[in-house]
């Protein structure tokens, strides 16, 4: 396909652009360029005739265009007015036209910008700073960079004046950074030199690291203090209120139980005169303590909640271990360990995640185990199941239905008959039932913790007479030699015998016929067209029997190899050729004919009047069954002799 590529697409004023032609057809008469998206004569820039290799200017020619033999167009010394679409019109030697449109945009070059500021040393949480990008330039986009990153989203940052001005309200220490502005258009981008904003702040409450407060006897204690501050803070350490040293780090080698106590770090900012302190309590153990498990959620909800189990206490240089169901942790995408193995997170808990869970702390000689923790996962209720599964009962028997739904806490059950509440029990018992007890029996399971309810409805029919059964099928249109069909005799009834008939006869013995489900289900494997029969099921008990209406199996088959009639293959000139094609198929196939490979008509009968030797050749009948997706064909050779030349030939139809 003929296409135009503008190189470049965005062009700087004064530069040049090449409208590059791709897929130029061969055998050309000529081509012509136009300003705009149409081939209008008054917008012609330049035309080129291949035969004469002559380029001739048009009404829109400016003197800055050069056309090349490959049809590409160079436009030099670009001006703003050159922006827009350009159309190439190609006339091929066969005088067929092709057109393609390209476009480019023109922009000016930009000068290097600079930043002006209204405050060079603002105070945190007090001052505002306004930066302005100079100079003001038309058709330019203004961008701002903080530490060479684009602007963060913040309600304290406001762009105004077409993004030329950046205002920082209530400056914070995080605003201490290198600020640059940039002017951009599609052909140039210029960045200013950086302006450093120096915000005075602090000190904040110091942080003592590492965070762990439990140590073993004999270890080294190395505490570091840091407080955010500008200018940087000066630090002092106190142990149990007694001054120790004026350093940022406190180091005590080979600690003992006597080094347990409160450790205070004080940070001081000489510019603001402010002091802040932080205290941590350090415990030194002679031996590791027995671990215990804490949980962030004691009653998680299935498929909703995550649970984080943490092994306490936090001890430096310690290995943490976990067990679930007295086994080491299984590999699962729902189980995640923290970097130090101290926290085990179960994502999207399930009812199978109850545990027990144990954690351990390993020392040189042994592993100390925590007590086991069991999760109480709330779930359900699932859809309740009503048993037994019978739907037909005889009068006089006892009806005993039981309902169960998986649930934690255990579900509360209610029974309804025909929508009317009966009782709040798991089991429903009705003695000596009559026809009046027929109806819709609903079991409702409710989980009081989650507030969720689920119901199951069962139709109960009480009748001395068995109902007329019906046949349900899992496949109404099976394909021969491919599909299986399962017939099921409905309904399921108590103390009932199920029987089957095919075409009024009892079931034939066949490895393709299988009875299951107490003879309620009849399965035909690998159906054939011969299985397209009337199937009847029957139910009987000691007092009654009944048969279903017949269900006829509609087996899709074929098309078989077609037969062309009549069988004659030799004809006399002048006879009528009347060929009929037939193929066994369900549903009936679609027919089509080809003579010497050339498609003819989509009919079952092919009729040609007064044939001649020109009608010699191969006659193919094609059959296709859209339902089975299968096709078939047959080919017949027909010879037509001139009249009287070959005695004994058929005279045709």
């Amino acid at each position: 396909k003929l296409t135009i590529e503008s190189t470049p697409f965005n062009v700087a004023e004064g530069k040049e652009v090449l409208l590059l032609v791709h897929n130029l057809p061969q055998h050309l008469f000529g081509y012509s360029w136009y300003k705009g998206e149409r081939v209008d004569g008054n917008r012609q820039i330049i035309g080129y005739v291949i035969g004469t290799q002559q380029a001739t200017p048009g009404p829109a020619y400016s003197g800055r265009e050069i056309i090349y033999p490959n049809a590409s167009l160079l436009i030099q010394n670009i001006i703003q007015n050159d922006t827009g679409f350009y159309t190439l019109h190609v006339i091929k030697s066969d005088l067929v036209n092709e057109e393609a449109t390209g476009q480019f945009r023109v922009y000016p070059e930009l000068p290097k910008p600079s930043i002006s500021s209204n405050n060079s040393k603002p105070v945190e949480d007090k001052d505002a700073v306004a930066f302005t990008c100079e100079p003001e330039t038309q058709d330019a986009t203004y961008l701002w960079w903080v530490n060479n990153q684009s602007l963060p989203v913040s309600p304290r940052l406001q762009l105004s004046n077409g993004n030329r001005t950046l205002t920082l309200f209530n400056v914070t220490r995080n605003d201490t950074a290198s600020y640059k502005c940039e002017t951009q258009n599609p052909v140039s981008a210029r960045r200013s030199d950086s302006v450093i904003l120096n915000v005075l702040y602090g000190p904040d409450a110091p942080t003592i690291s590492p965070l762990n407060t439990s140590y073993r006897s004999g270890e080294n204690l190395n505490l570091s203090c840091h407080a955010a501050s500008n200018p940087p803070a000066q630090y002092s350490w106190f142990v149990n209120g007694t001054f120790q040293q004026s350093t940022q780090e406190l180091f005590i080698p080979n600690i003992t139980v006597n080094n347990s106590g409160s450790y205070t770090c004080q940070a001081h900012n000489s510019d603001t005169g402010l002091n802040r302190t932080t205290v941590t309590t350090i415990t030194v153990y002679a031996e590791p303590p027995k671990p215990f498990i804490t949980s962030n959620n004691s009653n998680p909800v299935e498929d909703e909640d995550a649970v984080a189990l943490t092994c306490e206490p936090e001890i430096q240089n310690t290995t943490y271990l976990w067990w679930v169901n007295n086994q080491s942790l299984p590999v699962s995408p729902r189980l995640q360990l923290s970097n130090d193995n101290r926290t085990l997170t179960l994502l999207s808990v399930t009812r199978n995640d109850v545990g027990p869970y144990e954690c351990g702390i390993q020392n040189e000689l042994s592993v100390d185990h925590s007590d086991p923790v069991i999760l109480n996962v709330l779930y359900g209720p699932d859809d309740p199941t009503i048993s037994p599964s019978y739907t037909y009962y005889r009068p006089g028997v006892n009806l005993s239905l039981s309902c169960h739904a998986a649930s934690n806490p255990p579900a509360q059950y209610s029974w309804l008959i025909d929508g009317n509440i009966q009782q709040h029990t798991q089991e429903l018992f009705i003695s000596n039932i009559t026809e009046k007890n027929s109806g819709l029996y609903t079991c409702q399971a409710n989980n009081s913790a989650s507030g969720h309810s689920r119901t199951t409805v069962k139709t109960i029919t009480v009748s001395a007479e068995l109902p007329k059964p019906s046949i349900s099928s899992n496949n109404s249109k099976p394909v021969e030699d491919k599909d299986a069909v399962a017939f099921t005799c409905e309904p399921e009834a108590q103390n009932t015998t199920y029987l089957w008939w095919v075409n009024g006869q009892s079931l034939p013995v066949s490895p393709r016929l299988q009875l299951s489900n107490g003879n309620r289900t009849l399965t035909l494997f690998n159906v054939t067209r011969n299985d397209a029969r009337a199937y009847v099921c029957g139910i009987q008990n000691s007092v009654s029997a009944n048969r279903s209406d017949p269900v006829t199996l509609d087996v899709l088959y074929g098309p078989d190899t077609p037969i062309i009639s009549p069988p004659d293959s030799s004809y006399l000139s002048g006879a009528n050729l009347n060929l009929s094609c037939h193929s066994a198929s369900n549903p009936s196939p679609q027919y089509s004919w080809r003579i010497n490979g050339i498609p003819q008509q989509h009919t079952q009968v092919l009729f040609i009047a007064k044939i001649t030797p020109n009608n010699n050749g191969t006659y193919a009948c094609f059959v296709s069954n859209l339902a089975t997706g299968r096709n078939n064909s047959i080919v017949k050779s027909i010879t037509v002799s001139a009249s009287g030349t070959s005695p004994g030939l058929s005279a045709g139809a």
Epitope: G30, S32, R38, Q44, P57, G58
Partner: antibody
């Protein structure tokens, strides 16, 4: 091959609006202008305007500005012309056409009859 | 707008003879490389059919008895020899600018 299939004939009341469709097949619909041409019974051809479906760019004959509105749906390869405030003067056969300039492919035409 | 004037409005030509249809533009529609004039044929109940593009280029599939000539403002469509099937209306159209106007049409009958 290139084909333009236009919508069927329309009988409209004066003052009403009608929207004629032109479904294109056999080429890249978005890349070529669709022209609209009017022919009143027993009269010649009158150029209404054109649309480039890919960009939605339109050009109208001044005589038809406010009368005709062109739209294009690239997803269904269909161009539309809406004629508003119909009068008896708008009774005509309307054609769509396309191809590289000039226009070698035409729809079969849509007859619009305006009658009280 | 460019006005295209066709003449004659109708003509009758004997089978096998030459038919000549003229189209005059109110301003030039030619550059030094191209002429932006085209000819269409329209039969009753049918859309127009492109015959000649750019004044003299025969559209693919159009019989060679059709020919076009002219530049600037004066253009001619010739049909020789005319055949029965050439009975139709013939229109010229320019593509010099927007709007692209058509000529008033010429009705050709075969005697």
């Amino acid at each position: 091959q290139v084909q333009l299939q236009q919508s069927g004939a329309e009988l409209m009341k004066p003052g009403a609006s009608v929207k004629i469709s032109c479904k294109a097949t056999g080429y890249t619909f978005s890349d070529y202008w669709i022209e609209w041409v009017k022919q009143r019974p027993g009269h010649g051809l009158e150029w209404i305007g054109e649309i480039l479906p890919g960009s939605g760019r339109t050009d109208y004959n001044e005589r038809f500005k406010g009368k005709a509105t062109f739209t294009g749906d690239v997803s269904s390869n269909t161009a539309y012309m809406k004629l508003s405030s119909l009068t008896s003067e708008d009774s005509a056969v309307y054609y769509c056409a396309t191809g590289t300039t000039p226009f070698g492919y035409w729809g079969q035409g849509t007859l619009v009859t305006v009658s009280a | 707008d460019i006005v295209l004037t066709q003449s004659p409005a109708s003509l009758a030509v004997s089978l096998g003879q030459r038919a000549t249809i003229s189209c005059r533009a109110s301003q030039s529609v030619s550059t030094s490389s191209y002429t932006y004039m085209h000819w269409y044929q329209q039969k009753p109940g049918q859309p127009p059919k492109l015959l000649i593009k750019y004044a003299s280029n025969l559209e693919s599939g159009v019989p060679a008895r059709f020919s076009g000539s002219g530049s600037g403002t004066d253009f001619t469509l010739n049909i020789h020899p005319v055949e029965e099937e050439d009975t139709a209306y013939y229109y010229c159209q320019h593509s010099w600018e927007i709007p692209r106007t058509f000529g008033g049409g010429t009705k050709l009958e075969i005697k």
